[in-house]
Interface confidence: medium
């Protein structure tokens, strides 16, 4: 089969060569070729060139359209991993480490606390918080995780909240909270996660993470 293909290729190449040679002879005005033949060959050649040029233009248009489409609606996604912090703040700390995602500069992790978006739109925002607590060692209040929003010029808002009672297991019982929802974000808006007791949060691989995805 390969040999037959090779012969076919060589035959086509030879035909192309003859065709090009004929055009050359037409251009130099060789008497052995009739005017009619030359006109036919020339128009055939022009047709080929036109086709090539049109294809090129179409490809260019398609590419530029793809680029425009890409520019207008780039993928925006982030997934960050929890980071233990010595600070007493109730806002959880995150890091671009391990198997994290930061699609481009249209979403950034600021101060290790908040995911900030540059484009307006609908975003699916989620957080998983795993914590280890004990009923006796903790206060009566449940462990609460909140997904919060800070828009420029606006005060912080709680978007989602979940509460879990403390475990009776000793020294502590692991529990996970998952928060997730779709929200309209303005350019410059930041989302962050707040918990009642950051010292109880589990920072082992895969336990606590936070992210968003532009829809």
């Amino acid at each position: 089969h390969r040999r037959l293909d090779k012969i076919e290729d060589e035959r086509n190449l030879h035909e192309d060569f003859v065709f090009m040679k004929t055009i050359q002879r037409c251009n130099t005005g060789e008497r052995s070729l009739s005017l009619l033949n030359c006109e036919e060959i020339k128009s055939q050649f022009e047709g080929f060139v036109k086709d090539i040029m049109l294809n090129k233009e179409e490809t260019k248009k398609e590419n530029s359209f793809e680029m425009q489409k890409g520019d207008q609606n780039p993928q925006i996604a982030a997934h960050v991993i929890s980071e233990a912090s010595s600070k007493t703040t109730s806002v959880l700390q995150w890091a671009e480490k391990g198997y994290y995602t930061m699609s481009n500069n249209l979403v950034t992790l600021e101060n290790g606390k908040q995911l900030t978006v540059k484009r307006q739109g609908l975003y699916y925002i989620y957080a998983q918080v795993t914590f280890c607590s004990n009923r006796e060692a903790s206060s009566q209040a449940p462990f609460i995780a909140s997904l919060c929003l800070k828009s420029p010029g606006r005060f912080e808002r709680i978007l989602l909240r979940a509460a879990n009672t403390h475990s009776s297991a000793k020294p502590c019982g692991q529990q996970s909270i998952h928060l997730g929802g779709v929200f309209e974000l303005q350019p410059g808006a930041s989302v962050f996660v707040n918990v009642t007791d950051p010292s109880q949060v589990s920072h082992g691989t895969g336990f606590t993470s936070f992210g968003l995805l532009k829809l």
Epitope: V91, N111, K113, K150, P152, G153, F155, E156, S190
Partner: nanobody, 119 residues
Framework: EVQLLESGGGLVQPGGSLRLSCAAS????????MGWVRQAPGKGLEWVST????????YYADSVKGRFTISRDNSKNTLYLQMNSLRAEDTAVYYC????????????WGQGTLVTVSS
């Protein structure tokens, strides 16, 4: 009428500490981002720090990161700036500012309090 009154400035040696306070009145303090801005002698205004309305988010200029801590007490309508490891270049008039939004945008300023870091 919005009023911001700073206090706590003074003369301190390099490496020393100071705590500035800002008493706010005339607006719902707990609903606004607040911040500190400073002006060194013969220089322009420099943003120092901002804290969000509930106090959950804080922002700092690179020049003060790790040395200064901004905080607020919404029950007392008071803003604070704890300044540690002070340097000569921190010498400036420190202004308390109320923000309509954005961490470096403010619409009201106090009269300022002078902090001088010198041996």
């Amino acid at each position: 009428e919005v009023q911001l009154l700073e206090s706590g400035g003074g003369l301190v040696q390099p490496g020393g500490s100071l705590r500035l306070s800002c008493a706010a009145s005339g607006f719902t303090f707990s609903q606004y981002d607040m911040g500190w801005v400073r002006q060194a002698p013969g220089k322009g205004l420099e943003w120092v720090s901002t804290i969000s309305s509930r106090g959950w988010l804080t922002y700092y200029a690179d020049s003060v990161k790790g040395r200064f801590t901004i905080s607020r007490d919404n029950s007392k309508n008071t803003l604070y700036l704890q300044m540690n490891s002070l340097r000569a270049e921190d010498t400036a008039v420190y202004y308390c500012a109320k923000g309509p939004g954005g961490r470096r945008r403010f619409d009201y300023w106090g009269q300022g309090t002078l902090v001088t870091v010198s041996s």
